[in-house]
């Protein structure tokens, strides 16, 4: 049952004389393994013998006999699925039909394969895409229906006979479906490749030429243009004429329209290959090109830069930057449309020419207030001198200048006066908006830049003001030179250094801390009695009567200041002692008599001693001597002595008379 045999292989294989052929082949004999295989060349079935006749190229039998041809022809298959064959070398007369006679135990089959062997290597075939456009990548394919393991080949690409530098990818196929060698080349054709010959060359392993295929490239592209201008440098003066010509060097397909563009914008009613510009003006300066279109798209020529030369136009000045801060740098730029560019500039400041300034830019490294004003310039080129434009204003800003603090009061200023000061300045830009004063005080500012100090203090020494715009400028401090009465007047004892004893020499000093003006007068007073007009008050020999409250008063032309009362204390021994008797110096016996030792002393008497008429001291030491009851024998003269830290004093004698009571007289 023939349907049981299934074969797969290429229908026809191609080769050339001396090459080889490799025949990929698979089969399936379903009833068992292959027992016999014969490869026929052009087999024919003999009905008489019921066998195939023809040249046997290969035979595999059970007895193992193989014809000599078998070295050239090899069966590379097996007994159940592979039927691959190789013929090496292959000859021209191998062309025709190859017959594979297969026999298994019960079945037979003849499978036919066509072999086409040419005398010389046949050419490969170049395949191109249906349309090629410039700059669009395409793949060129070179296909050869040949591949054999025993005969290596290579495919090379050439453009106009020169190997192409793009890398090609070569692939081979030796399968039951197809046998081929293919080379693919990725390529971005330019318009200049149009009409060029591309060759795919077949070479052997040594690079020897075997065959080739050629094609002519048809590269679709936009028109390629050349622009020509008269005059050739495209530099003209106003009023001259200019001619531009557009030439098409290549177009595929043919061009359809022509137009001209200036600075990218289409010029109306200019649809020929020649553009005539008569009596040009400076406005016609610019970049010109022609544009020609075909079905692919528009093509543009290179741009021609038409320069219409003219004398400088009225100039303008640009300032970097205004307003400028004093001390900063400023740059002035003279801007004037001109062609060719100006070669010389003249600069003006407030209408007066600035000497030595001939450049487009003027740089002032350190701006000063006098640099302010209007700056203008004039530009000059080979065609003439431009006009001076309106100019630009430079505003120079600076802190207030020459700031002074001015005292408005008549001099001198006295403590307690109301002082008015003004803050003056010479110039300022921008205007002064506020003022500051040092030191700070709870002072009035009745108007801008005026300070009023009510009841000025003696210690208000200096005042400074600042005038402020964006910056503050301080004036030198001004001395108020406030005049005031003597201050901190006090009495100071300068001698003796210790406590004052009666009879001492005493000096009191009138001190004060400060006075302005310095010339002063002194007054010494004790309880409203004037004592002297010197800075010192002197006592040659102080007496207790000099004790009391002393003050000194110091005055200058501004005022007068008194000291606190200073108490002068004089220490002296007890004096003016006397014995007083109570109830009197005559007392009746039996009554009470009190003797008191009266004295004047500083410090007070600390110790008393009593004496009788015999100068005998009595055992009593207090100020009072109390006799109770008093006896007639107590009659006599008594005296006392007082003692303090300074010394002793004694009283004169005082006589006490004690008389008998009526009772005593009665008894006698």
């Amino acid at each position: 049952d023939s349907s049981k045999w299934v074969f797969e292989h290429p229908e026809t294989l191609y080769a050339w004389e001396g090459a080889c052929v490799w025949i990929p082949c698979t089969y399936r004999a379903l009833d068992g393994d292959l027992e016999s295989f014969i490869l026929f060349h052009n087999p024919e079935y003999n009905k008489n013998t019921s066998k195939f006749d023809g040249t046997r190229l290969y035979e595999s039998t059970k007895d193992g006999k193989v014809p000599s041809e078998q070295k050239r022809v090899q069966f590379l298959g097996d007994k159940n699925k592979n039927c691959t064959l190789s013929i090496h070398p292959v000859h021209l007369n191998d062309s025709g039909q190859l017959g594979l006679r297969m026999e298994s135990k019960t079945e037979k089959w003849m499978e036919r394969i066509h072999l086409n062997v040419s005398e010389r290597p046949f050419p490969p075939h170049i395949q191109l895409p249906p349309e090629i456009q410039e700059s669009q990548e395409v793949t060129l394919t070179c296909l050869l229906n040949f591949s054999c393991y025993g005969y290596p080949i290579q495919l090379q690409w050439l453009l106009e006979g020169v190997p192409m530098r793009q890398a090609a990818v070569t692939s081979t196929s030796l399968t039951i479906k197809s046998v081929f060698t293919r080379s693919e080349l990725k390529f971005s054709p330019q318009w200049s490749h149009h009409g060029k010959i591309v060759t795919c060359q077949l070479q052997d392993a040594d690079g020897k030429f075997l065959s080739n295929d050629t094609v002519q490239l048809n590269v679709k592209h936009t028109p390629k243009l050349e622009i020509k201008v008269t005059p050739s440098d495209a530099i003209v003066r106003e009023g001259d004429s200019v001619t531009m010509t557009c030439e098409v060097s290549s177009s595929n397909p043919e061009y359809t329209t022509v137009s001209w563009l200036k600075d990218g914008t289409s010029l109306k009613k200019q649809n020929t290959f020649t553009l005539n510009l008569r009596e040009v003006t400076k406005d016609q300066s610019g970049k010109y090109c022609c544009q020609v279109s075909n079905d692919v798209g528009p093509g543009r020529s290179e741009e021609v830069f038409l320069q219409v030369q003219y004398a400088p136009e009225p100039s303008t000045v640009q300032i970097l930057h205004s307003p400028a801060v004093e001390g900063s740098q400023v740059e002035f730029l003279c801007m004037s449309l001109a062609n060719p560019l100006p070669t010389n500039y003249t600069w003006y400041h407030n209408g007066k020419e600035m000497q030595g300034r001939t450049e487009e830019k003027v740089h002032i490294p350190k701006i000063l207030p006098w640099h302010a004003g209007t700056y203008s310039c004039v530009a000059e080129n080979i065609l003439g001198t431009g006009q001076r434009g309106p100019g630009a204003e430079l505003d120079v800003q600076y802190p207030p200048k020459k700031v002074t603090t001015v005292i408005q009061n008549p001099m001198p200023i006295r403590e307690g006066d109301t002082v008015t000061l003004s803050c003056n300045y010479n110039s300022s830009n921008p205007s002064v908006t506020r003022y500051e004063w040092k030191p700070h005080g709870a002072w009035e500012e009745p108007s801008l830049g005026v300070l009023k100090i009510q009841n000025v203090g003696w210690d208000n020494t200096t005042i400074a003001c600042a005038a402020c715009n964006s910056w503050c400028s301080w004036a030198s401090p001004v001395a108020l030179n406030v005049q005031y009465a003597p201050r901190d007047v006090r009495v100071r004892k300068i001698k003796p250094l210790s406590e004052i004893h009666s009879g001492n020499s005493v000096s009191l000093q009138c001190d004060f801390s400060s006075s302005h003006p310095k010339e002063v007068q002194f007054f010494w007073e004790k309880n409203g009695r004037l004592l002297g007009k010197e800075s010192q008050l002197n006592f040659d020999s102080i007496s207790p009567e000099d004790a009391g409250s002393y003050s000194c008063w110091v005055n200058n032309s501004i005022g007068q200041t008194a000291s606190k009362a200073w108490t002068l204390e004089v220490l002296y021994a007890p004096r003016r002692l006397r014995v007083s008797m109570s109830p009197g110096d005559q007392v009746m016996e039996g009554k009470s008599a009190t003797l008191t030792c009266e004295s004047d002393a500083n410090p007070p008497v600390s110790h008393y001693t009593w004496f009788d008429w015999n100068n005998q001291s009595l055992p009593y030491h207090s100020q009072k001597l109390r006799l109770e009851p008093v006896k007639v024998q107590h009659s006599g003269a008594y005296w006392c002595q007082g003692t303090n830290s300074v010394g002793k004093g004694r009283s004169p004698l005082s006589t006490l008379t004690v008389y008998y009571s009526p009772e005593t007289i009665g008894r006698r």
Partner: nanobody, 114 residues
């Protein structure tokens, strides 16, 4: 002509208040320090308070916190405001300044009854 005119004295109960005044002429008043003095019965004259030309003040310890001395330069007048008066404050009160030399005003009697 140098002149001092004292006024405002009177009789007041203990704890009461009184203000005495002294108008001065014949000196530059605003530049003079002025003092109030008093003479108590049987006692030496004593200084009670002083107002300096800059209006700073000085008080005797015995009157501190009770008496206030002040001046009005526009009126050439010095004042003594006496509060919390005590019988010991009974005296003739005078105003004076060294600029007046030995000249004293007539004084003004202040009597504090208990």
């Amino acid at each position: 002509e140098v002149q001092l005119v004292d006024s405002g004295g009177g009789l007041v109960q203990a704890g009461g208040s009184l203000r005495v005044s002294c108008e001065a002429s014949g000196i530059t008043f605003s530049r003079a320090a002025m003092g109030w003095y008093r003479q108590r019965p049987g006692k030496e004259r004593e200084r009670v308070a002083v107002v300096n030309s800059d209006s700073s003040t000085i008080y005797a310890d015995s009157v501190k916190g009770r008496f206030t001395i002040s001046r009005d330069n526009a009126k050439n007048t010095v004042y003594l405001q006496m509060n919390s008066l005590e019988p010991e404050d009974t005296a003739v009160y005078y105003c004076w300044s060294p600029g007046f030399g030995s000249y004293w005003g007539q004084g003004t009697q202040v009597t504090v009854s208990s």
